[in-house]
Amino acid sequence: SGPVKELVGSVGGAVTFPLKSKVKQVDSIVWTFNTTPLVTIQPEGGTIIVTQNRNRERVDFPDGGYSLKLSKLKKNDSGIYYVGIYSSSLQQPSTQEYVLHVYEHLSKPKVTMGLQSNKNGTCVTNLTCCMEHGEEDVIYTWKALGQAANESHNGSILPISWRWGESDMTFICVARNPVSRNFSSPILARKLCEGAADDPDSSMV
């Protein structure tokens, strides 16, 4: 038994659970997902039994080996996978555990504006970046672009303080997860502050 292997996949993609076996005489190999049997292989007779019909077209063993390739990944394929190699030459089955994380490809992040104040010619507000469908494990970065600055800010909330008369600035939210990255539509400080002066309530940008 080796240490737990962490694997990452993307929705619609494929992942291969690598299996290198030194066992000479293999009687059977059993793959399970969250304790539910997934596939049983009996090398002697060349038998592969896929427990659930819906997985039949998603399961493959590339290059004639015993590594499991799972295709057309779905979010709920995330979980613990376990393989047991059974042999009459072994007292205990040889085992390996895997943890699979399946992530979605990120759509464009949405930006909302918080309450805004205009004091002494300075527009002060917060911009909040989020994913519409609440995707998990998303890291947000803000890019503030302008003649006077080119800065990055980590986190989903960007505090803004922009003085009327200053050169315009552009704000872009970048969202990342382990399998994809995307960015929001650009937001101009001047337009943001003009609009917010008319309507002080929180709004979509």
Epitope: S10, G13, S152, T170, S180, R181, P186
Partner: antibody
Framework: EVQLVESGGGLVQPGGSLRLSCAAS????????MSWVRQAPGKGLEWIGE????????NYAPSLKDKFIISRDNAKNSLYLQMNSLRAEDTAVYYC????????????WGQGTLVTVSS | DIVMTQSHKFMSTSVGDRVSITCKAS??????VAWYQQKPGQSPKLLIY???TRHTGVPDRFTGSGSGTDFTLTISNVQSEDLADYFC?????????FGGGTKLEIK
């Protein structure tokens, strides 16, 4: 010094295969998306595809998806491009490129490796 | 695919002049555009990203502008070392695409 060095180019016959390598140094390779871009003689740049840090996502230009395979080995700080069924129009300088800060524009480029497809 | 069109394959200018290289996207790409310079026999070098932000170390005579479908790279006070090909790139959507390039010639 941040550096990308391509290798593996050369003369190959039509229908043949070739595997290009890109050795990265001077930065944490395992944290970056990486891309391949090619340039036919006297022509513009063409993006081939990209791979994310742990190889779980690979995006290709649709026209090249079925003949090129991008892979990487973070332990070796290396990026690879497997090219199959090569034709004369695949003759180009092939560059590996790193996106600035993991954005979408490329601030580090290799010197390129020339692939010539000819009989 | 989004097509990036650089209508001028060649542009001729003199040292000290100002020159504008244009790039047109076949659909709206916001400000997701970068510009590269490629000198003869060299790899491309990043000049501008997000349409108008200069990359570190790029002289301020290089200026990017535009949004939506029309983009411009302006070189003011052209120097002899600016002799190169210039390419635009969109990264608004997959696949990333480049313009065909504009070769800047110094008279």
């Amino acid at each position: 010094e941040v550096q990308l060095v391509e290798s593996g180019g050369g003369l190959v016959q039509p229908g043949g295969s070739l595997r290009l390598s890109c050795a990265a140094s001077g930065f944490d390779f395992s944290r970056y998306w990486m891309s391949w871009v090619r340039q036919a003689p006297g022509k513009g740049l063409e993006w081939i595809g990209e791979i994310n840090p742990d190889s779980s996502t690979i995006n290709y230009a649709p026209s090249l998806k079925d003949k090129f395979i991008i892979s990487r080995d973070n332990a070796k700080n290396s990026l690879y491009l497997q090219m199959n069924s090569l034709r004369a129009e695949d003759t180009a300088v092939y560059y590996c490129a790193r996106p600035d800060g993991n954005y979408w524009y490329f601030d580090v480029w290799g010197q390129g490796t020339l692939v010539t497809v000819s009989s | 695919d989004i097509v990036m069109t650089q209508s001028h394959k060649f542009m001729s200018t003199s040292v000290g002049d100002r020159v504008s290289i244009t790039c047109k996207a076949s659909q709206d790409v916001g400000i997701a555009v970068a510009w590269y310079q490629q000198k003869p026999g060299q790899s491309p070098k990043l000049l501008i990203y997000w349409a108008s932000t200069r990359h570190t170390g790029v002289p301020d005579r290089f200026t990017g502008s535009g949004s939506g479908t029309d983009f411009t790279l302006t070189i003011s006070n052209v120097q002899s070392e600016d002799l190169a090909d210039y390419f635009c790139q969109q990264y608004s959507s997959y696949p990333y695409t480049f313009g065909g390039g504009t070769k800047l010639e110094i008279k």
